[in-house]
């Protein structure tokens, strides 16, 4: 009589998380009598997965009717597979006894679980940076299996090369995580730019997952300041304009000072957006020249996005004011500048 064989035909089975896994096992003989048990792992620490004789295994069902007297198929189906179910499963035949005695084990079937990576989450720098500076973006995705995964970074459709990526853990695990950092050099034109983290994995059937971050969250474009005087009006009032241009974000406070004293403070709001995503703002100040005996020092002070204030100053000469002023006069575009207006 031929010796009983325990046959596990598949060396490995790969299943998507959430699906059911079928682990096949047949025996070559009904003799000797005794139960079949399924274990995950081998040796003394093995985990009992299914035992028809006793116990409650809600996720495991026999493929064939185990009560049939001539049943030699002890395949099982495990439902709702998770990455934690990965491992090598052994179909083990026992000989009846008190207790039952292990007679023969199948060769084992390795169950690998294909788990989709979570949606990539991209996080940018905690504080904004200005053009020409380098900022770092981080992309994280978790819970995938197998370990092989591809992650790419793009800025406005162009792949980034200054990238560092790690997949953890390095050794064998039920599931893995990926973390990648991309370094991006900002330009003034990046308000509308976007970085994309693209994750490709066998479970995604060629349709990669993407996480995005807008550079508008990371960039600060400081304003240009230009102060000009409009024509002298008949009533001896001078209209001075402070043009604040090409700034981002919109959070901006403008203060007019006359001879160092605050004249007016304004907050930018509901500004129209430029094509490049930046904003412009113009503020006017009417100065009554006749009310002053001495020259008037005017300062346009701009505080942008919590940064130190930028000033443009100039002086209006009270002594010699013609009734009509010709062309507009602008203050130079430097941090702090005084300009005499005649």
């Amino acid at each position: 009589e031929e010796e009983l064989q325990v046959i596990q035909p598949e060396k490995s089975v790969s299943v998507a998380a959430g699906d059911s896994a079928t682990l096949n096992c047949t025996v070559s003989s009904l003799i000797p009598v005794g139960p079949i048990q399924w274990f995950r792992g081998a040796g003394p620490g093995r985990e009992l997965i299914y035992n028809l004789k006793e116990g409650h295994f809600p996720r495991v069902t026999p493929v064939s009717d185990p009560t049939k007297r001539n049943n030699m198929d002890f395949s099982i189906r495990i439902s709702n597979i998770t990455p934690a179910d990965a491992g090598t499963y052994y179909c083990v035949k026992f000989r009846k006894g008190s207790p039952d005695v292990e007679l023969k084990s199948g060769a084992g079937t390795e169950l690998s679980v294909r788990a989709k990576p979570s949606a990539p989450v991209v996080s940018g720098p905690a504080v904004r940076a200005t053009a020409e500076h380098t900022v770092s973006f981080t992309c994280e995705s978790h819970g995938f299996s197998p370990r092989d995964i591809t992650l790419k970074w793009f800025k406005n459709g162009n792949e980034l090369s200054d990238v560092q990526t790690n997949v953890d853990p390095a050794g064998k695990s039920v599931s893995y995580s990926i973390r990648s950092t991309a370094r991006v050099v900002l330009t003034r034109r990046d308000v509308h730019s976007q970085v994309i983290c693209e994750v490709a994995h066998v479970t995604l059937q060629g349709d990669p997952l993407r996480g995005t971050a807008n550079l508008s969250e990371a960039i600060r474009v400081p304003p240009f300041l230009e102060v000009t005087q409009q024509s002298m009006r008949a009533d001896n009032q001078v209209n001075v304009t402070c043009q604040v241009t090409k700034f981002y974000p919109q959070r901006l406070q403008l203060t007019w000072l006359e001879n160092g004293n605050v004249s007016r403070t304004e907050m930018a709001s509901a500004l129209p957006e430029n094509k490049d995503g930046t904003y412009n703002w113009t503020s006017w100040l009417l100065v009554n020249v006749s009310a002053h005996r001495d020259d008037v020092k005017l300062t346009c002070q701009v505080e942008h996005d919590g940064q130190p204030a930028v000033n443009k100053s100039f002086s209006v000469k009270v002594s010699a004011h013609p009734k009509e002023q010709g062309s507009n006069t602008a203050a130079e575009n430097t941090g702090t500048n005084e300009r005499n207006i005649y």
Partner: antibody, heavy 124, light 106 residues
């Protein structure tokens, strides 16, 4: 505990078909195999065959060509038909249950409860 | 086909131990059942799965099974134990009975 009550024709002529029924009282009908066994006068027991609630059958190879065992789960009954009887089929016929429950495996259950027996005589 | 062999008869004095044997090829690799049948009655299961006793069966009934032989042992045999005893096993989904042993209590 299951109880079995059986009935059927006791006197048959050769070539007729023996027909017996066994009613099941108590227990879960779906956790048993239902058996027929016979015992010729002064002789030993001979297993005829079995059926479970879903209609799965096993028969004694020596009788297989003449035997049909069926089940009526709505009535909790199972039946035996043995065709083309001869005098050699004269015997006491028993129905019996084999409880396998949820903790059994193949060949781990035998005949734990028996019916009262029906004497069947085949005579010309 | 598989065969189970029993000695036709065994005699025992009351209070003594009766051993009834059943032999078959590698019977120890299978489960053995034992049934008691008294005259004019249906068989009653006295031992199942080699050595297990159904509820209601006296403790004096015990069983063993190894190698090629299964044994039903009745210790402290009583007159009421006089009956025919049948062993049974399964072979390829077929129940096989031994020829039976008549136990006589002298």
């Amino acid at each position: 505990q299951v109880q079995l009550q059986q009935w059927g024709a006791g006197l048959l002529k050769p070539s007729e078909t023996l027909s017996l029924t066994c009613a099941v009282y108590g227990g879960s009908f779906s956790t048993y195999y239902w058996n027929w066994i016979r015992q010729p006068p002064g002789k030993g027991l001979e297993w005829i065959g079995e059926i479970n609630h879903s209609g799965s059958t096993n028969y004694n190879p020596s009788l297989k060509s003449r035997v049909i065992i069926s089940v009526d789960t709505s009535k909790n009954q199972f039946s035996l038909k043995l065709s083309s009887v001869t005098a050699a089929d004269t015997a006491v016929y028993y129905c019996a249950s084999s409880h396998y429950g949820s903790g059994s495996f193949p060949d781990s259950y035998g005949m734990d409860v028996w019916g009262q027996g029906t004497t069947v005589t085949v005579s010309a | 086909s598989y065969e189970l062999t029993q000695s036709p008869s065994v005699s025992v004095s009351p209070g003594q131990t009766a051993s009834i044997t059943c032999s078959g090829d590698k019977l120890g690799d299978r489960y053995a059942w034992w049934y008691q049948q008294k005259p004019g009655q249906s068989p009653v299961l006295v031992i199942y799965q080699d050595d297990k006793r159904p509820s209601g069966i006296p403790e004096r009934f015990s069983g063993s099974n190894s190698g090629n032989t299964a044994t039903l042992t009745i210790s402290g045999t009583q007159a009421m134990d006089e009956a025919d005893y049948y062993c049974q096993a399964w072979d390829s989904s077929t129940a096989v009975f031994g020829g039976g042993t008549k136990l006589t209590v002298l």
